[in-house]
């Protein structure tokens, strides 16, 4: 798998992972106790390129282009976990890894 | 062949709007980025703004963020540059010019406009 | 944002003489460079992306050289039609810059 990290001055056109910070503290997120703030990233830019798609099937229905079906999108293909501690519905203090918060590669799918 | 089609400039007071528009044929237009450039009285070229094909990611230089916005109309093959809040600094001849996609970065204009002048003054 | 500096700022050539003009970058912009031309009254042309490649219809005595943040634009011969304005410009960062510029002048 292979994916492309850029910074936010980039002028890269294709599919790419932009580094983002989340602030918990800025949403107004305060059942949220720790990290306060994390390296969250995103993914932008085009999908155009076979090399940055997922799936082959990805590539072939694009070429297919059935009615209704959209281009390829550039969205995350892998995911990683970040522990939390945080308070739940029922006030109690809660230590946990919340699944599919970071994102560690952009491709297109 | 590839042509793009300018207008909408003319004299506006300090502190008016003015909306530019580009007219684009001989290329699939939506799959294009397309960008403004102004050049000031005998002065040097200034990239102003630049719109990703979709339309769906757009750019600014510092010198007209919130005060200029750029857009496209795809269906119409169709560039537009509104401009509010206008000052004196803004007297420029204002170029739309579309991305060559000659590599993966955007930002190589291979296809520019016939110009149009823009005169801020009251 | 990346400055480009461009010198001369003009240049007085011969018909037929090389011409050698340079472009600085303050910080890296790989090779994403391109060079363009202006006439009075005209827009600009695009004459080389990527340092060195030349864009369709641009002719040989064009060549462009450099990397990192030092570039060249050599023209081999000067022709009439090459009397003009020459800019330099980086799209490696947003935002897009221009060089200043350099003149092309009849001596």
């Known amino acids: 798998d292979f994916g492309l990290d850029c910074d936010e001055h980039s002028t890269e056109s294709r599919c790419c992972r932009y580094p983002l910070t989340v602030d918990f503290e800025a949403f107004g997120w305060d059942w949220i106790i720790a990290p306060k703030r994390y390296k969250a990233n995103y993914c932008s830019g085009e999908c155009e390129f076979v090399f940055l798609q997922k799936y082959p099937h990805t590539h072939l229905v694009h070429q297919a282009n059935p009615r209704g079906s959209a281009g390829p999108c550039c969205t995350p293909t892998k995911m990683s976990p970040i522990n939390m501690l945080y308070f739940n519905g029922k006030e109690q203090i809660i230590y946990g890894k919340i699944p599919a918060m970071v994102v560690d590669r952009c491709g297109c799918s | 062949q590839v042509q793009l089609v300018q207008s909408g400039g003319g004299l506006v007071q300090p502190g008016g709007s003015l909306r530019l528009s580009c007219a684009a044929s001989g290329f699939t237009f939506n799959t294009y980025a397309i960008s403004w450039v102004r050049q000031a009285p005998g002065k040097g070229l200034e990239w102003v703004s630049t719109i990703t094909g979709s339309g769906y990611n757009t750019y600014y230089a510092d010198s007209v963020k919130g005060r200029f916005t750029i857009s496209r109309d795809n269906s119409k093959n169709t560039l537009y540059l509104q401009m509010s809040s206008l000052r004196a600094e803004d007297t420029a001849v204002f170029y739309c010019?579309?991305?060559?996609?000659?590599?993966?970065?955007?930002?190589?204009?291979?296809?520019w406009g016939q110009g149009t002048t823009v005169t801020v003054s009251s | 944002d990346i400055q480009m500096t461009q010198s001369p700022a003009t240049l007085s050539v011969s018909p037929g003489e090389r011409a050698t003009l340079s472009c600085r970058a303050s910080?890296?912009?790989?090779?994403?460079l391109a060079w363009y031309h202006q006439k009075p009254g005209q827009a600009p042309r695009l004459l080389i992306y990527g340092v060195s490649t030349r864009a369709t219809g641009i002719p040989a005595r064009f060549s462009g050289n450099g990397s990192g943040t030092e570039f060249t634009l050599t023209i081999s011969s000067l022709q009439s039609e090459d009397f003009a304005v020459y800019y330099c410009q980086q799209h490696n960062n947003w935002p897009l810059t221009f060089g200043g510029g350099t003149k092309v002048e009849i001596k």
């Open positions: 010019a579309k991305d060559s996609r000659y590599n993966w970065n955007y930002g190589i204009f291979d296809y």
């Open positions: 910080q890296s912009v790989s090779s994403n």
